[in-house]
């Protein structure tokens, strides 16, 4: 089947959510692990990731259409320590499939704001760290 992975971000007050979304068929879920890495250009794996999610087949979903599964990593308050390069990945050892999303970056600025760049859905997100608004 056709499986792909996308990255996105959302802001809720001072919190920043980094979201990895895997699009797949229902029957393809089992055996996949989705994971988010930081500053791991060559060895992004579940063991080295910030967070991982093992997908389960949801018996409550009917049909064989494409569905999505999401891993969400929440940063409660962005600090300079969160600056870096991030990547959403997924793999199934059973099927022999590995997906690697585009790299995106968080840059904490001197003014106390931060920007998220490199996301495909929203090419450039800039957040105000203090006020918690999208600018």
């Amino acid at each position: 089947g056709c499986i792909n992975i996308t990255s996105s971000a959302s802001q809720e007050g001072t919190r920043l959510n980094l979201i990895c979304t895997v699009w797949h068929k229902k029957e393809e879920a089992e055996g996949f692990v989705v994971f988010l890495c930081k500053d791991r250009s060559g060895d992004c794996s579940p063991e080295t990731s910030l967070k991982q999610l093992r997908l389960k087949r949801d018996p409550g979903i009917d049909g064989v259409g494409e569905i999505s599964s999401q891993l969400m990593f929440t940063i409660s308050q962005v600090t300079p320590l969160h600056s870096g390069t991030y990547q959403c990945c997924a793999r199934s050892q059973k099927s022999g499939i590995r997906l690697q999303g585009h790299f995106f970056s968080i840059l904490f600025t001197e003014t106390g704001n931060y920007t998220v760049t490199g996301l495909k859905q929203r090419q450039h997100l800039e957040f105000s760290h203090n006020e918690g608004t999208l600018s």
């Epitope: 692990v33 794996s45 063991e47 199934s92 050892q93 099927s95 022999g96 499939i97 590995r98």
Partner: antibody, heavy 112, light 107 residues
């Protein structure tokens, strides 16, 4: 129908390099990765390494210094090269698409 | 490396009998376990993945269970064609590792 077929020399001299080919059909190497496993006669299985659908590789750390896995997607072939062979490398070598589909294996004997 | 301690090493069972094989792992593998059947002179066949999921085409008399560091394979009603070697495997961490195998024979 998914099919994998290993091929290579049945006999290799100690200290020489082993070259094996896994020819696949029924799927694309751009969509699915291939593992190499081996099994000494009468023994258990050992994972050697993986070449993923995106071309990236992962190796067993115990073999990494002398193992290389590559592919030719246009020919639907995956290659294993392992140097400095010793008698303890005598085994049946299998390629597999993920864990689901395995070749029948090729017996490799390391002997002088 | 994660060690996979498989038991028993060999097992004899009568036709129709229910048999179980166990694998203990040296650390929690979060259900990233699989079971294979290997008949004499053949390549391994995947039976169970993700600890308990039955691979397509595998008879329902095979089942897998477990979590953490303890996993098991159960055959409910031994059949003649089940005479084979069985291996557990973990795919939680590299290198992927296998148990030493269980030889299942008909009594």
């Amino acid at each position: 129908q998914v099919n994998l077929q290993e091929s290579g020399p049945g006999l290799v001299r100690p200290s020489e390099t082993l070259s094996l080919t896994c020819t696949v059909s029924g799927f694309s190497l751009i969509s699915y990765g291939v593992n190499w496993f081996r099994q000494p006669p009468g023994k258990g299985l050992e994972w050697m390494g993986t070449i993923w659908n995106d071309g990236g590789t992962d190796y067993n750390s115990a073999l990494k210094s002398r193992l290389s896995i590559s592919r030719d997607t246009s020919k639907s072939q995956v290659f294993l090269k392992m140097n400095s062979l010793q008698t303890e490398d005598t085994a049946i070598y299998f390629c597999a698409r993920g864990f689901e589909h395995w070749g029948q294996g090729v017996m490799v004997t390391v002997s002088s | 490396d994660i060690q996979m301690t498989q038991s028993p090493a060999s097992l004899s069972a009568s036709l129709g009998e229910t048999v179980s094989i166990e694998c203990l792992t040296s650390e929690d593998i979060s259900n990233d376990s699989a079971w294979y059947q290997q008949k004499s002179g053949k390549s391994p066949q995947l039976l169970i993945y993700a600890a308990s999921r039955l691979q397509d085409g595998v008879p329902s008399r095979f089942s897998g269970s477990g979590s953490g560091t303890r996993y098991s394979l159960k055959i409910s009603g031994m059949q003649p064609e089940d005479e084979a070697d069985y291996f557990c495997q973990q795919s939680y961490k590299y290198p992927l590792t296998f148990g030493s195998g269980t030889k299942l024979e008909i009594k």
